[in-house]
């Protein structure tokens, strides 16, 4: 029986009965917040073999092992993950071992096992046999291994039953519990699964099978399941569904998303039955189950019940996320905010059409209107008193409307009004008149030439770069010395630079008047020698990275014909040199015969250039003969058992920290202080833990359904 969609068992352990007939959970399985310690021995779900999304266990009192609950759980597919994880075991106070002895494959995602004060048998499981990459696993704050004394079956009797693998240079037995080995298939099977008797399964099987080389005997499917058979792709007239099975059109036509209060229904696209058309596609008509490509951004009409939508915060802008056509009027009144320009672009950047008017007033946080980066039409179907459809009043820091070289905006009906925008040059307004087709509509008082641009350097000269030199992490640039009419008016220069993968940045990107700016700024004093050209060395840059750079002259606010003269350069794009790449990630090696090793790795996170080849080096190592860390027959060798508190493992500091013995005659010396890099790494680690814990709490503590 397929159960789902997603099963959440909380508060009452008897809810576990819901799993009684499940063979596959299509979705996630949550078992959490059961605070009363119960006896779980009577609960056993041997039918459950597959969870298609993830398994989350959190604060379940009294549960000591998962092996009895889910003895045959073989595959967690990770089709959808919980914060990048397919298996999360968090704050399970009484869990002593994981015990999922039949778990053979986690298809996607990593594992997070954290703050389980009594949990052992973690170092005895080789997760690389279950997951593709173990580098993202997070196993922290559980019972310290030296307090666990984990013993695999048969070790005490000196008849070890489990197989050995190497983890972190330790060659050891692999097991889930004191009486359950970790299953490994013969090397002859390669990537294939195997039966209990070590016979290789059909290539389409995943995890295990009941008979060898038979695609109808799989416990789970590598690709898709259809009519009792594991298939590499869904047959004609069937469609992939939830990442693991094939369904027919009729099935897909009759299902609705439980996450929505509308009844939009699923669609078929690219051979898959899915909840929504993917990005860039739209349903082909109201009764259609199929998607067609959108021309440009997909249309989404948003309507304001009160006709006028006031944008006075990020929260109010959030309501417009994804909207391309706004039916109504926009009133923008942003007085303050953090990182406001990029937040507004995120939520309003897709708007193409406003059917009514646009009014921007008292928006002192705005430097530019470029956050409305796709606005192309203001219809002016509704206008302000005086027949205005674009109205800009008292915006103390507004300097740019849009980048008119890359913008077509039409105002179909209505006039424009501009007043009390002291940093907005009148030339910018006149340019908007031309582009929008409103020239001639405005009367004299509609664009005030006295109080617009009164505090801006509106007459700008162009600074020209004279030389650029690059290295792997530095750029040196120089530019012509700017000579204003009165040399004393030139104070200094400011260099602005930022990473720019594409040559499409503008001066006002990500900039607002509250201090947020996506550009880095460096002040450059005037060279004392009048014949030396000003310049700067930008350092601490990333190798093989394109940067955008421009320079502005800082001048006295000298008024000349009611305007301040200034100077700035065009934006220059320049790439740093290539450098040595960072180390390759997730290096894994496995032997597939007595004379071969297969080595796999992922590319480096920082290629620092175009990678052309890898160098693989190897050398023979002497076999590790020191197989036993402890002699368990000798009482004095067994570590003292102490109950772990479920906090993060930190070596205890004794009264006298002088533990390391230095070479020669020096005697004991203090442990080295942590480097800045180590401190930073610890800080980031602590931050990451907090972020995950917040995510966990926000996800699982939800209001009771009505």
């Amino acid at each position: 029986e397929i159960c789902g969609p997603g099963i959440d068992i909380r508060n009452d352990y008897q809810q576990l009965k819901r799993l009684e007939n499940c063979t596959v959970i299509e979705g996630y399985l949550h078992i959490l917040l059961i605070s009363k310690a119960e006896d779980y021995r009577s609960y056993r779900f041997p039918k459950l073999t597959v969870i298609t999304e993830y398994l989350l266990l959190f604060r379940v009192a009294g549960l000591e092992s998962l092996g009895d609950l889910f003895p045959n759980l073989t595959v967690i597919r990770g089709w959808k993950l919980f914060y990048n994880y397919a298996l999360v075991i968090f704050e399970m106070t009484n869990l002593k071992d994981i015990g999922l002895y039949n778990l053979r494959n986690i298809t996607r995602g990593a594992i997070r096992i954290e703050k389980n004060a009594d949990l052992c048998y973690l170092s005895t499981v080789d997760w690389s046999l279950i997951l593709d990459a173990v580098s993202n696993n997070y196993i922290v704050g559980n019972k310290p291994p030296k307090e666990c004394g984990d013993l695999c079956p048969g070790t005490m009797e000196e008849k070890p039953m489990c197989e050995k693998t190497t983890i972190n240079n330790e060659y050891n037995y692999r097991c889930w519990t004191t009486n359950r080995c970790q299953k490994m298939c013969p090397s002859t099977c390669g990537k294939r699964a195997c039966t209990e008797n070590n016979e290789c399964c059909h290539p389409e099987c995943l995890g295990s099978c009941s008979a060898p080389d038979n695609d109808t005997a799989c416990v789970a499917c590598r690709h898709y399941y259809y009519a009792g058979v594991c298939v590499p792709a869904c047959p004609p007239n069937t469609y992939r569904f939830e990442g693991w099975r094939c369904v027919d059109r009729d099935f897909c036509a009759n299902i609705l998303s439980a996450e929505s209060s509308d009844s939009e229904g699923f669609v078929i696209h690219d051979g898959e039955c899915m909840q929504e058309c993917p990005s860039g596609f739209i349903r082909n008509g109201s009764q259609s189950m199929y998607c067609i490509p959108c021309e440009g951004p997909c249309p989404k009409v948003c309507e304001e019940e009160k006709k006028t939508k006031t944008i006075d915060s990020v929260t109010s802008a959030q309501m417009l996320q994804g909207c391309t056509i706004f039916k109504g009027n926009l009133l923008i009144n942003i007085r303050r905010g953090n990182n406001i320009a990029s937040e507004l672009e995120n939520f309003m950047g897709l708007i193409e059409v406003v059917t009514g008017y646009v009014k921007i007033r008292h928006s002192h946080a705005l430097v530019s209107l470029s956050f409305l980066k796709n606005l192309r039409l203001i219809l002016g179907e509704e206008q302000l008193e005086g027949n205005y459809s674009f109205y800009v009043l008292d915006n103390q820091n507004l300097q740019q409307l849009w980048d008119w070289d890359h913008r077509n905006l039409t105002i179909k009906a209505g006039k424009m009004y501009f007043a009390f925008n002291p940093k907005l040059c009148v030339s910018e307004i006149y340019r908007m008149e031309e582009v929008t087709g409103t020239k001639g509509r405005q009367s004299k008082g509609d664009i005030n030439t006295r109080n617009n641009g009164e505090r801006a350097s509106c007459e700008s000269d162009v600074l020209h770069f004279t030389s650029t030199t690059t290295s792997k992490n530095r750029i040196i640039i120089t530019w012509h010395r700017y000579r204003p009419p009165d040399y004393r008016d030139l104070i200094s220069f400011t260099v602005y630079y930022k990473e720019a993968p594409f040559k499409n940045v503008t001066e006002y990107d990500g900039q607002d008047a509250c201090g947020s700016n996506s550009w880095n700024m460096v002040d450059v004093d005037l060279p004392p020698n009048k014949d030396v050209e000003p310049g700067i060395l930008l350092h601490g840059l990333k190798p093989w990275t394109q940067y955008a750079v421009y320079v502005k002259a800082v001048t006295l606010t000298m008024v000349e014909n009611d305007h301040i003269r200034g100077a700035k350069s065009e934006i220059l794009y320049i790439r740093t040199n290539a450098s040595v790449p960072s180390i390759p990630l997730d290096v894994l090696s496995a032997s597939n015969s007595s004379s071969q090793l297969i080595v796999k790795w992922n590319p480096p996170s920082l290629p620092n250039g175009n990678l052309s080849y890898y160098i693989v080096r190897w050398q023979r190592q002497p076999q590790d003969g020191y197989l036993y860390r402890h002699n368990y027959c000798s009482k004095d060798k067994i570590p003292i058992r102490k109950y772990a508190d479920g906090t993060i493992d930190i070596e205890e500091v004794t009264e006298n920290p002088k533990t390391e013995v230095c070479g020669g005659e020096k005697g004991p010396c203090c442990a080295c202080p942590k480097t800045e890099a180590e401190k930073q790494a610890e800080k980031e680690e602590a931050e990451y833990r907090k972020v995950f814990e917040n995510f966990l709490h926000n996800s699982i503590f939800v209001p009771r359904p009505e």
Epitope: D8, N254, L256, S260, D262, S263, G265, Q275, Q287, E706
Partner: nanobody, 128 residues
Framework: EVQLVESGGGLVQPGGSLRLSCAAS????????MAWFRQAPGKEREGVSA????????YYADSVKGRFTISRDNSKNTLYLQMNSLRAEDTAVYYC?????????????????????WGQGTLVTVSS
């Protein structure tokens, strides 16, 4: 408070027609999916038809396809079910229901668990 009031039921001869209405209040009608269910004496409640809010996509049970038509008027906050070629087996109490968010994943349009609010029902009797 959400309210759904069905009307338009009554006695009709086989082959006849009826139009059911469901007047809704207490929620933003134009953003919620709606459906008609029915329950015949001694039988389980079953889905008859459903309609989405945004696009008007419709769903019908096999037994009523081609005979019944669901529609909605968002400006009047009303859901309709036009029933033609009625048969004796269509006799039942007809309920109007409104969709609700119901956790994760999916469900079939005719599953009652996907609907959060229900009307009191209107009786339709098809008899000669």
């Amino acid at each position: 408070e959400v309210q759904l009031v069905e009307s338009g039921g009554g006695l009709v001869q086989p082959g006849g027609s009826l139009r059911l209405s469901c007047a809704a209040s207490g929620f933003t009608f134009g953003t919620f999916g709606m459906a008609w269910f029915r329950q015949a004496p001694g039988k389980e409640r079953e889905g008859v038809s459903a309609i989405s809010a945004s696009s008007g996509r419709t769903y019908y049970a096999d037994s009523v396809k081609g005979r019944f038509t669901i529609s909605r008027d968002n400006s009047k906050n009303t859901l309709y079910l036009q029933m033609n070629s009625l048969r004796a087996e269509d006799t039942a109490v007809y309920y109007c229901a409104v969709r609700s968010k119901n956790g994760a994943g999916y469900g079939f349009w005719y599953e009652a668990r996907l609907y959060g609010y229900w009307g009191q029902g209107t009786l339709v009797t098809v008899s000669s």
